[in-house]
């Protein structure tokens, strides 16, 4: 069904999921339609993210289904917003020595975390595991992201950009194949193997101490063994 979803052939092929991982479990950061941010034990349509890299290690993170930017208030609370505020909705990305990624607000200094406590990022610190993230390519069939493409002839450019803030629905060239270091993909979600139904089930290994290929937040990150 090549044309089953209007999203096929668009940049939705570049969706990723950010997840925390301990030795036994993992939680995926998801941005709900109402702006609430929490973690899920598995990939969901609300944990599918677009991450745009900017200069000096800054990133902008958007939930593609909620159409909301990930933002942070002055107390360190994270939430999803339809409106992009450069002070609240840009995060500094840093890769720790263990290969895990942390994101913190340059404005308020708090770490993005799936834990409830708010902690400021300090260089050299060892954040708790629920503030350290790995990224994983989307394993959810694109048909599940079946939202209509904006009808541009009935909308102003302003309306259009609000519905599609990062232009994720505008067709573009397909992603190039992953480098060899990233080729250990999990089975596709159409596969009937146990891993396909649980691409990020319960993590076995502890913290990974090697850097893997990929330099930006969309590159391959080291990850523990999944069951």
């Amino acid at each position: 069904y090549p044309n089953a979803s209007p999203l096929l052939g668009s940049s939705w092929g570049g969706l990723i999921h950010l997840y925390t991982a301990t030795a036994r479990n993992s939680y995926h950061l998801q941005i709900h339609k109402n702006g609430h941010v929490d973690g899920a034990p598995h990939q969901t349509i609300y944990s599918a993210l677009m991450i745009r890299s900017e200069d000096a290690g800054f990133v902008v993170i958007t939930g593609v289904m909620s159409r909301r930017y990930l933002c942070m208030d002055f107390r360190g609370n994270i939430f999803g917003s339809h409106y992009f505020d450069p002070e609240n909705c840009r995060f500094q990305h840093q890769t720790l020595e263990n290969g895990y990624d942390v994101y913190h607000s340059p404005q308020y200094h708090f770490l993005v975390s799936l834990g409830r406590a708010k902690r400021a990022f300090l260089p050299g610190m060892n954040p708790p595991p629920y503030s350290q993230f790995l990224s994983r390519r989307n394993e959810i069939p694109l048909i599940h992201f079946n939202t209509p493409i904006p009808r541009r002839h009935t909308q102003s450019a302003e309306d259009d950009s609000e519905r599609d803030p990062l232009n994720v629905l505008k067709p573009r060239a397909r992603m190039t194949p992953a480098p060899a270091s990233c080729s250990q993909e999990l089975p596709s979600a159409e596969d009937n193997s146990p891993m396909a139904s649980d691409p990020l089930g319960v993590v076995r290994g502890g913290r990974v101490n090697t850097h893997a290929g990929g330099t930006g937040p969309e590159g391959c990150r080291p990850f523990a063994k999944f069951i």
């Epitope: 301990t22 899920a40 319960v202």
Partner: antibody
Framework: QVQLVQSGAEVKKPGASVKVSCKAS????????MHWVRQAPGQGLEWMGI????????SNAQKFQGRVTMTRDTSTSTVYMELSSLRSEDTAVYYC??????????WGQGTMVTVSS | AIQLTQSPSSLSASVGDRVTITCRAS??????LVWYQQKPGKAPKLLIY???SLESGVPSRFSGSGSGTDFTLTISSLQPEDFATYYC????????FGPGTKVDIK
Amino acid sequence: QVQLVQSGAEVKKPGASVKVSCKASGYTFTNHYMHWVRQAPGQGLEWMGIINPISGSTSNAQKFQGRVTMTRDTSTSTVYMELSSLRSEDTAVYYCARDIVDAFDFWGQGTMVTVSS
Amino acid sequence: AIQLTQSPSSLSASVGDRVTITCRASQGISSALVWYQQKPGKAPKLLIYDASSLESGVPSRFSGSGSGTDFTLTISSLQPEDFATYYCQQFNDDFTFGPGTKVDIK
């Protein structure tokens, strides 16, 4: 409100198996991992294992590998823990507990399992 | 696997006393430490998460501190309902519990 309701007390003979249930309500069952923790009489808490509620994937403490089986039924929002080859030292209260990323916030009331010949 | 040790294993105190319980991890666990209170015949109750954050509904006389390997639970003024056993638990790479500290009446 969140509730975890466990099955009733059990008395088993050595070598037998026991299956304890934990029915969750008041929240979206598939959004939280569930753990099993046990406590022998007069002793401390001992973590047994974890189950992913959506996939059924499990990970157990090394001590229980091969003896404990955790399953779930998403249609009834229930998790199960089966312990086989019971011995007297398995006499304990068994708890299920909900994971909220940084803590176990809700616990079942506990199920007393007595292993005696 | 990371091991947790608690001290003291038991202590006797009076109402109004300041009580301090320590929990030590065999290796660094950042702030991924939780404290629970358990009374006889009851399930554990969450008191502190992320080493120092007070769980909603828990009295402010309870506080937690520490990071890395050394952690402390403090009860600033012991109340009659606080006589119980207290457990620490780490969330860094597993879910290990400490052996517990029993607080009883002097």
